[in-house]
């Protein structure tokens, strides 16, 4: 084994422990919670990040509904089961044997059941709508400048291919970022829109997952873009299956 490297850290995930004991004595970084080795040249999957985050305070969110099939992450944090690739397993269960099905971003898409509940496949979230409200400014941002800055952010900070940023809408003070990525569009090595959205969400909250980088400093033509609320909607390739009781609640 080679001697310890000077810079054995994970730039894309601070919730890791890195050690020079990988193949060939190279630096290897393991996600806290799961111990799985992560690729530090890209984003870590949301499942592994949630697993690592379990000690963090609960962060429940409630969103307005952009379509009848949109899902909202109302359940807050849980300790997820991740597959060998670090993706969410289709069925998640808690310590009391209550189980439910999730989509590819880990959001519940069925009613809760018991251990007999079956989740045949991991349903892909192919459309994510990030709804932001920015703090008051002297005037509205220029739409095309805002569009360019947000596309640059997703391309450079989150390494998301530009083709997956479908649109940026702006009606002061609301900004909407649409991410779209079908199963057929996602090639090997492509960042998942769910992972990019999660990193963005944590950045906006001032809880950056990047190692050693400063927090997110969003500026449009030098003017700070400060977000005061974030709502995220998830749309799956197959609509969720909830009972009527929940839908009318």
């Amino acid at each position: 084994h080679t001697a310890a490297q000077d810079n054995c850290t994970c730039p894309t995930n601070k919730m890791t422990v890195c050690s020079p004991d990988g193949p060939g004595g190279r630096c290897q970084c393991r996600a806290l919670g799961s111990g799985m080795a992560v690729d530090c040249s890209t984003l870590t999957s949301k499942c592994l990040l949630l697993k690592a985050r379990m000690s963090a305070p609960k962060n429940a969110r409630t969103l307005v509904r952009p379509s009848e099939h949109a899902l909202v992450d109302n359940d807050g944090l849980y300790d997820p089961d991740c597959d060998p690739e670090g993706r969410f397993k289709a069925r998640q269960c808690n310590q009391t044997s209550v189980c439910w099905c999730v989509n590819s971003v880990g959001v519940r898409r069925t009613d809760k059941g018991d251990l007999s509940l079956r989740c045949d496949e991991l349903v892909r979230t192919h459309h994510i709508l990030i709804d932001l409200r920015h703090r008051p400014t002297a005037g509205a941002f220029n739409h095309s400048d805002l569009d360019a800055e947000l596309r640059r952010l997703f391309r450079e900070r989150y390494r998301l291919h530009p083709k997956f940023v479908a649109a940026v809408h702006y009606e002061q003070p609301t900004i909407q970022i649409e991410l779209r990525q079908n199963t057929s569009q996602k090639a090997a090595g492509d960042v998942d829109i769910g992972d990019a959205a999660y990193y963005f969400e944590r950045d906006i909250k001032g809880e950056s997952l990047f190692q050693g980088r400063g927090g997110l400093d969003l500026r449009v033509r030098g003017e700070p873009l400060q977000v005061e609320r974030t709502l995220i909607y998830y749309l799956d390739e197959i609509p969720p299956k909830f009972s009527m009781k929940r839908l009318t609640a």
């Epitope: 422990v17 004991d21 990988g22 193949p23 290897q28 111990g35 799985m36 060998p84």
Partner: antibody, heavy 114, light 107 residues
């Protein structure tokens, strides 16, 4: 050269605790995981948990979670494994081992619970 | 947790013969498998790490292969000192786990 030197054999009564030490030398102590592995007489190897000496981050095999504590002292490059509420089935040789591929091992510490 | 199953439990061969030891994981683990040799009264010794990477000081007759779920340790020509117990171990995720061991005995 890399060395892991463990403390001597222990004889304990059921219900007691034991604390085994593992002193590292010959490498940067804070850069590598230290694992604890035990082996009951005539049995296979069982991973108990590990600790990252740089920041003391540790995690344990669920089987031992309520009874084991791993700590470190960077000033002496020593890792400790304490196992409480001992029972007869904890009689085993306890090893410390370095890294994820356990490239260096301590000589082992026999703990007898009787 | 990831379960590792080694086979056979016991392998009886003569010096000079080729030994093939198997380790199967309950789920895919890439190449995060390591092989150890243990002799009575001694600590285990690392032979191969990350499925196929050799360790300095370990004789070239020891080699490893495999990825995903199926892994093999091969000893090309057995020497008298090779008769011992061999363990595989995974470091893909916590908890790390070991196989139950293969005892290589003289025929």
């Amino acid at each position: 050269q890399v060395q892991l030197v463990q403390s001597g054999a222990e004889v304990k009564k059921p219900g007691a605790s034991v604390k085994v030490s593992c002193k590292a030398s010959g490498y940067t102590f804070t850069s590598y995981w230290i694992n604890w592995v035990r082996q009951a007489p005539g049995q296979g190897l069982e991973w108990m948990g590990n600790i990252y000496p740089s920041d003391s981050y540790s995690n344990y095999n669920q089987k031992f979670k309520d009874r084991v504590t791993m700590t470190r002292d960077t000033s002496t490059s020593t890792v400790y494994m304490e196992l409480s509420s001992l029972r007869s089935e904890d009689t085993a040789v306890y090893y410390c081992a370095r890294g994820s591929s356990f490239d260096y091992w301590g000589q082992g510490t026999l703990v007898t619970v009787s | 947790e990831i379960v590792l199953t080694q086979s056979p439990a016991t392998l009886s061969l003569s010096p000079g013969e080729r030994a093939t030891l198997s380790c199967r994981a309950s789920q895919t683990i890439g190449t995060s498998i390591h092989w150890y040799q243990q002799k009575p009264g001694q600590a285990p010794r690392l032979l191969i790490y990350y499925a196929s990477e050799s360790i300095s000081g370990i004789p070239a007759r020891f080699s490893g292969s495999g990825s995903g779920t199926d892994f093999t340790l091969t000893i090309s020509s057995l020497e008298p000192e090779d008769f011992a117990v061999y363990y595989c171990q995974q470091s893909n995720s916590w908890p790390f786990t070991f196989g139950q061991g293969t005892k290589l005995e003289i025929k």
